[in-house]
């Protein structure tokens, strides 16, 4: 059976605040839990949703959450449905409303000495307590001539007289919170001796050095007094004007005229009317100086034909709010049609090529006018002036492929080689007109090239095949100086390529023929056994029909390759003693010997007093130190080859003889003793 571990319970809740109706069930099998409100299923919303099996309220709503909630658990296997206890919210709320006239039926019926009843339309639960205000001052119950009924939310004035005139507002508070009237009621009961507003001054915005006029009139019996004050409470009269209001004139009808208005004249002007009886009436109006800022720049715009686009003109900050309009070719745009103005936007519907040009956004107010141009380009699909052609380009020379197109705006041209985008580098350059230059054509440049010309309106493309006309060349060029080992077999290769397969032959530079033990086999010079006489200058000649011939000169040297007669050995030396590393090499030409110690070449001219390299190639190091330890390499080289051999040098401390050892004890390892 389904058992409720936690059941929802009725509770207080605050309007707009969080709440949770708990429900937890236990059953032998899986159960589905859902909620009912007044018997109807509760659908999840962002405001009210199931949280596990409980029902969560992000913000309680007094209208949507009033009623009885019930948690229902359903076991689909057994079919059992169990319902929790009912739960409801006692929702506390308060809601503002206006102050309205309850009695008499209309304002027109209000006369001195009649009863006037006002009602405060603030409602709430629990019922709030009310406080009434006249012109912002609290009215306490039991004051003369008025009574407050909290139950009916009414304020009754009996009888109502001119002294009750004013702005009536109310506030209410309860356990939930506080609210004040959303709309207040102005009670006006005439007393001839009270000043009454006939004409109130209005806020004025004027341009600098223009004139400003404030109108102000009161009526009363006897006539009331009228006085103008500027911000700092300085009175303004025709006899005593403050220094910064020298150009102010007060007319007999109460109007105030300011001429040649400057920034220091901006501010609040107060017109005060005082009747024989009653309070003074203070009316305020502000004088603002008109201003207009600069407009932000437009980025040029590129649109495509047939589309609909909008350009928004942000009006500059200004006072009064600047009016905005768009012009094209000196003509103001209409508010409907195909190209028109909508609000601050320029709208171009079904754009045509003829719509391209300069459009101007104008903004103006009393302070002046500002304008900003936007350049509109209508993009067209590129068209061909010259397509790339299948071309034969000569190897090693610059090659050109044209891709000449025209469109608005200027089209962007990109090139592809074998479907791969060509990025400009030292070999490829794309000119402004779209032509591709291959700086030094190579054999493998012979492939497909495709150019694509694009604008926002679309793109066109064409491809061409490049055939490279190979130059006659050695591949690779033979080394100009080569060595052959005496009494050994040797080969000197020579190969070339061209538009046609070239014929290759060798000859001696002096024109003499090759000896019988030297053969020329398809460009490879073969010496069966090198003799001293084989040294000399040779020429490899490559030729074909269309391209003629080319020559490569090679000087062959016959040499006895280097061998070491004496090689340095692993050496251990006491610190402070002298180390000798021997090295002797032979060969023809006679090899030179260099030493490398600790990974750097030992320069004989910079060795210092401790090191010396002998004529025979041996290296001597005097007064050795631990830092001299390491591998030493003897390098023997001549113009034909190079060979090296290495050995380690160990520098050790001299041992202190122990008493047990006799004077003739041998050292613990093989040493050089000097």
């Amino acid at each position: 059976a389904i058992v409720f571990i936690k059941q929802p319970s009725s509770q207080d809740a605050l309007q707009g605040r969080r709440a949770l109706l708990r429900c937890e069930v236990e059953a032998p099998g899986p159960v589905h839990v859902y909620w009912l409100l007044d018997g109807a299923p509760v659908q999840d919303t962002e405001r009210r949703f199931a949280q596990g099996s409980s029902l969560s309220f992000a913000a309680v709503d007094r209208l949507q959450d009033s009623g009885t909630f019930q948690c229902v658990a359903r076991d689909d296997v057994t079919g059992e449905e169990a319902r929790s206890a009912n739960a409801s919210f006692n929702i506390k709320w308060i809601e503002a409303g206006p102050v309205v006239l309850k009695h008499p039926a209309s304002e027109a019926e209000i006369q001195p000495q009649t009863q006037v009843t006002l009602r405060c339309h603030i409602d709430g639960h629990p019922r709030p307590t009310y406080q009434w205000f006249r012109d912002g001052t609290p009215l306490s119950d039991g004051q003369s001539n008025h009574t407050v009924s909290s139950k009916e939310r009414n304020l009754t004035l009996r009888p109502a007289g001119p002294e009750h005139s004013g702005l009536y507002s109310c506030c209410a508070h309860s356990a939930f919170g506080q609210a004040c009237s959303s709309q207040n009621f102005t009670l006006s009961i005439a007393d001839e001796s009270f000043a009454r507003v006939v004409l109130a001054p209005q806020d004025v915005v004027v341009a600098r050095y223009e004139e400003a006029m404030f109108h102000c009139q009161f009526s009363a019996q006897p006539p009331p007094s009228l006085q103008w004050l500027f911000e700092d409470e300085t009175p303004i009269t025709n006899r005593s004007r403050p220094p910064h209001l020298r150009r102010a004139t007060v007319f007999a009808n109460g109007s105030l005229l300011l001429t040649q208005v400057r920034p220091r004249n901006a501010g609040i002007y107060r017109c005060i009317g005082q009747g024989q009886r009653g309070p003074p009436i203070i009316l305020e109006a502000t004088l603002h100086l008109a201003e207009i800022e600069d407009m932000p720049l437009f980025e040029p715009r590129v649109f495509t034909a047939g589309s609909e686009e909008r350009v928004t003109c942000l009006p500059p900050k200004g006072l009064p709010e600047p009016s905005v309009w768009w012009e094209h070719a000196g003509v103001r745009l209409p508010t409907h049609g195909r190209v028109y103005q909508k609000g601050h936007e320029l709208v171009l519907a079904n754009i045509a090529e003829s719509d391209a040009g300069v459009y101007t956004c104008h903004a103006a107010n009393l302070a002046g006018q500002r304008r900003q141009d936007v350049n509109i380009t209508v993009a067209t699909v590129p068209s061909w002036l010259k397509k790339p052609q299948d071309s034969q380009l000569e190897e090693g020379k610059p090659g050109y492929l044209d891709c000449l197109t025209q469109a608005t705006p200027k089209p962007t041209v990109v090139w592809y080689r074998n479907q791969m985008l060509i990025s400009e580098d030292s070999r490829f350059e794309v000119f402004k007109n779209g032509t591709l230059r291959i700086n030094s054509v190579e054999v493998y440049d012979g492939t497909w090239y495709r150019c694509m010309s694009s604008t926002p309106a679309g793109s066109i493309e064409a491809q061409a095949r490049v055939q490279v006309l190979e130059k006659l060349k050695f591949t690779p060029p033979p080394q100009p100086q080569q060595c052959m080992e005496f009494d050994k077999e040797a080969t000197v290769p020579c190969s070339a390529t061209g538009r046609e397969k070239p014929t290759i032959k060798w000859e001696r530079a002096d024109g003499s023929s090759l000896p019988e033990w030297v053969t020329d086999n398809a460009g490879t010079l073969h010496f069966a056994r090198v003799t001293r006489d084989d040294a000399g200058n040779y020429t490899c000649i490559a030729s074909n029909g269309p391209q003629g011939q080319i020559r490569a000169h090679v000087q062959l040297t016959v040499a006895v390759f280097i061998t070491f007669k004496v090689e340095p050995e692993r050496t251990t030396v006491y610190q402070g003693h002298t180390a000798l590393l021997q090295c002797e090499a032979q060969g023809d030409p006679k090899p030179l010997i260099q030493w490398k110690g600790k990974d750097r070449i030992l320069d004989p001219t910079k060795l210092g007093p401790r090191m010396h390299i002998f004529q025979n190639g041996s290296l001597v190091i005097h007064d050795v130190a631990p830092e001299d330890s390491g591998r030493y390499t003897c390098i023997a080289g001549n113009s034909c080859n190079i060979k090296h051999t290495e050995a380690p040098l160990y520098v050790v401390d001299k041992p202190v003889p122990e008493e047990s050892e006799g004077p003739g004890s041998p050292p613990p390892y093989k040493m050089i003793q000097t």
């Epitope: 899986p30 076991d75 689909d76 296997v77």
Partner: antibody
Framework: EVQLVESGGGLVKPGGSLRLSCAAS????????MNWVRQAPGKGLEWVSS????????YYADSVKGRFTISRDNAKNSLYLQMNSLRAEDTAVYYC??????WGQGTLVTVSS | DIQLTQSPSFLSASVGDRVTITCRAS??????LVWYQQKPGKAPKLLIY???TLQSGVPSRFSGSGSGTEFTLTISSLQPEDFATYYC?????????FGQGTKVEIK
């Protein structure tokens, strides 16, 4: 002991109507969801309709929606299935089930001209 | 709608064999799955609910496992009275759907 007995089956022409009943005993009928399930001859089981304990929630298979109506009378411990606009493919044994743990023996509905 | 696919559709086995039937759901149904046994001319009988809980009175040789989309019914040692058709059904969402059934026959 839970008992479910279906009745009301029989032969009916295409386009005709039938009302099936299911008499329940041996459990608190008003606290349980009830279901109708059918099985065409030689075929598998097909769920038809469900009704919650107080008829708040009612569900139908797409194949019968708009033609069949499930209802219950908790005072009489009875479940009903009103079948209108019957088709040949509605021919089946109709079972009434308490949830899905206890089933009646079924009643055969044959729709044929 | 959630589709349930049973495999195999037919199964031949001998008494004492261990038999496994699989039910695959087209979307996650948590553990809201039941298994039935039906013999010819009879109403289906509930064997397993909540994917793995044995219904009261059902022999312990029947067991269920799985959750999400993969479920199995296992009969550890087949008895003569177990030759029948077995159905799975999901109780996760409406419409309630059944597998097409697995018929267990004597080899």
């Amino acid at each position: 002991e839970v008992q479910l007995v279906e009745s009301g089956g029989g032969l009916v022409k295409p386009g005709g109507s039938l009302r099936l009943s299911c008499a329940a005993s041996g459990f608190t009928f008003s606290s349980y969801i009830m279901n109708w399930v059918r099985q065409a001859p030689g075929k598998g089981l097909e769920w038809v309709s469900s009704i919650s304990s107080s008829s708040t929630f009612i569900y139908y298979a797409d194949s019968v929606k708009g033609r069949f109506t499930i209802s219950r009378d908790n005072a009489k411990n009875s479940l009903y299935l009103q079948m209108n606009s019957l088709r040949a493919e509605d021919t089946a044994v109709y079972y009434c089930a308490k949830g899905f743990d206890y089933w009646g023996q079924g009643t055969l509905v044959t729709v044929s001209s | 709608d959630i589709q349930l696919t049973q495999s195999p559709s037919f199964l031949s086995a001998s008494v004492g064999d261990r038999v496994t039937i699989t039910c695959r759901a087209s979307q996650d149904i948590s553990s809201y799955l039941v298994w039935y046994q039906q013999k010819p001319g009879k109403a289906p009988k509930l064997l397993i609910y909540a994917a793995s809980t044995l219904q009261s009175g059902v022999p312990s040789r029947f067991s269920g496992s799985g959750s999400g989309t993969e479920f199995t019914l296992t009969i550890s040692s087949l008895q003569p009275e177990d030759f029948a058709t077995y159905y799975c059904q999901q109780l996760n969402t409406y419409p309630r759907t059944f597998g097409q059934g697995t018929k267990v026959e004597i080899k």
